[in-house]
């Protein structure tokens, strides 16, 4: 499964999207958890509405909100107010009993603001060429890059 | 065991360019963010920034942004710390230090044994 | 940016002695704390993290405590190789900001 790297400025607001194939997962509940450790557990952060039908109602913990639009098959996580300890490898996941299936890993990087706007989109220029997108993000200066983890060593 | 294991001291005239090396080994390079540290004589510590060596992205504090360009080469396990225009107050002890979260920002544990940079006309 | 005070910027102890060192941070930094220890000529060694949390190999006379904006370092009870230099470190929010430092030399 693919990374997509998406980076926010501290104190501003971060989107992740993460889309899946709404028949696949009709009735299941989303989670977004946080990886811990190479091969630690994801610890999960928040979840959807635990009645499938009113998973669009927007579910809070802490910063960060989570909201389910099953017909179009797009679950959103907003990190409000990002900070430096936001920074980590997360997952989008669908649950269906105790099983939890990835529908997408995110790596969030949280940048210090830039000196000012003019330098905002130099902050990061990107070695590897892939496919970017336009990035999902919520005020915020960001790069969305798919990538997969290299093997360990 | 976990190493970082930095490039040897440098000289250099204001207004020039230094480039210091951090090698890793002992574990997943591209796993943990590399933070970069100085120490000028007699001082105390400045953080300077991070590179996450996985994605290549970076930041750094205000005070360096336009000066300081953090790199890597995940082929040789190496990140890379360059600061331009370089005065007399840059001459320090310039360290790389490992952070101990994977893939976040958890503090650091493990740190290379410094670089010293003078600058001196 | 936060600044992080610490006090005493030094203190002279004996072998044996429970030694503690404050750490003050402008503004809540929450567990976000670092404590290090150095010495003349060597790079920081980490000590502890999430303000409590101890490093791998780090022997248990270390220990850490605080939240917010108040934390301590203690060592429980002082050895030859301890005295050095002891730095704290919030990494909450950027930049990520040290201490001034606390010496402590024999008495």
């Known amino acids: 499964l693919n990374t997509t790297v998406l980076q926010g400025m501290a104190g501003q607001s971060l989107r992740v999207s993460c889309t899946y194939d709404a028949l696949k997962h009709w009735g299941r509940r989303k989670a977004w958890c946080r990886q811990l450790g190479e091969e630690g557990p994801c610890q999960r952060v928040v979840s959807t509405h635990g009645v499938w039908l009113l998973a669009f109602l927007k579910k809070r913990n802490g910063s960060t909100v989570i909201a389910d639009d099953t017909l179009a098959g797009t679950v959103t996580i907003t990190l409000k107010n990002l900070q430096a300890g936001d920074a980590g490898l997360y997952q989008c996941q669908s649950l269906r009993g105790r099983e939890a299936e990835v529908l997408q890993k995110v790596l969030v990087e949280v940048l210090e603001d830039p000196l000012d706007d003019q330098d905002a989109g130099d902050l990061w220029v990107p070695e590897e060429s892939s496919s970017f997108e336009g990035a999902q993000v919520e005020h915020s200066t960001s790069r969305n890059q798919e990538t997969s983890f290299p093997p360990t060593s | 065991q976990v190493q970082l294991v930095q490039s040897g001291a440098e000289v250099k005239k204001p207004g020039a360019s230094v480039k210091v090396s951090c090698k890793a080994s002992?574990?997943?390079?591209?796993?943990?963010?590399i933070h970069w540290v100085r120490q000028a004589p007699g001082l105390g510590l400045e953080w300077m920034g991070w590179i996450n060596p996985y994605s290549g992205g970076t930041t750094s504090a205000q005070k360096f942004q336009g000066r300081v360009t953090m790199t890597r080469d995940t082929s040789i396990s190496s990140a890379y710390m360059e600061l331009s225009r370089l005065r007399s107050d840059d001459t320090a002890v310039y360290y790389c230090?490992?952070?101990?979260?994977?893939?976040?920002?958890?503090?650091?544990?493990?740190w290379g044994q410094g670089t010293t940079v003078t600058v001196s006309s | 940016d936060i600044q992080m005070t610490q006090s005493p910027s030094s203190l002279s102890a004996s072998v044996g002695d429970r030694v503690t060192i404050t750490c003050r941070a402008s503004q809540g930094i929450s567990n976000y704390l670092a404590w290090f220890q150095q010495k003349p000529g060597k790079a920081p060694k980490s000590l502890i993290y999430a303000a409590s949390s101890l490093q791998s190999g780090v022997p248990s006379k270390f220990s850490g405590s605080g939240s917010g904006t108040d934390f301590t370092l203690t060592i429980s009870s002082l050895q030859p190789e301890d005295f050095a230099t002891y730095y704290c470190?919030?990494?909450?929010?950027?930049?990520?900001?040290f201490g001034p430092g606390t010496k402590v030399d024999i008495k």
């Open positions: 230090a490992r952070d101990g979260g994977y893939l976040a920002l958890y503090g650091t544990d493990v």
């Open positions: 002992g574990y997943t390079f591209t796993g943990y963010y």
């Open positions: 470190q919030q990494y909450s929010t950027y930049p990520f900001t």
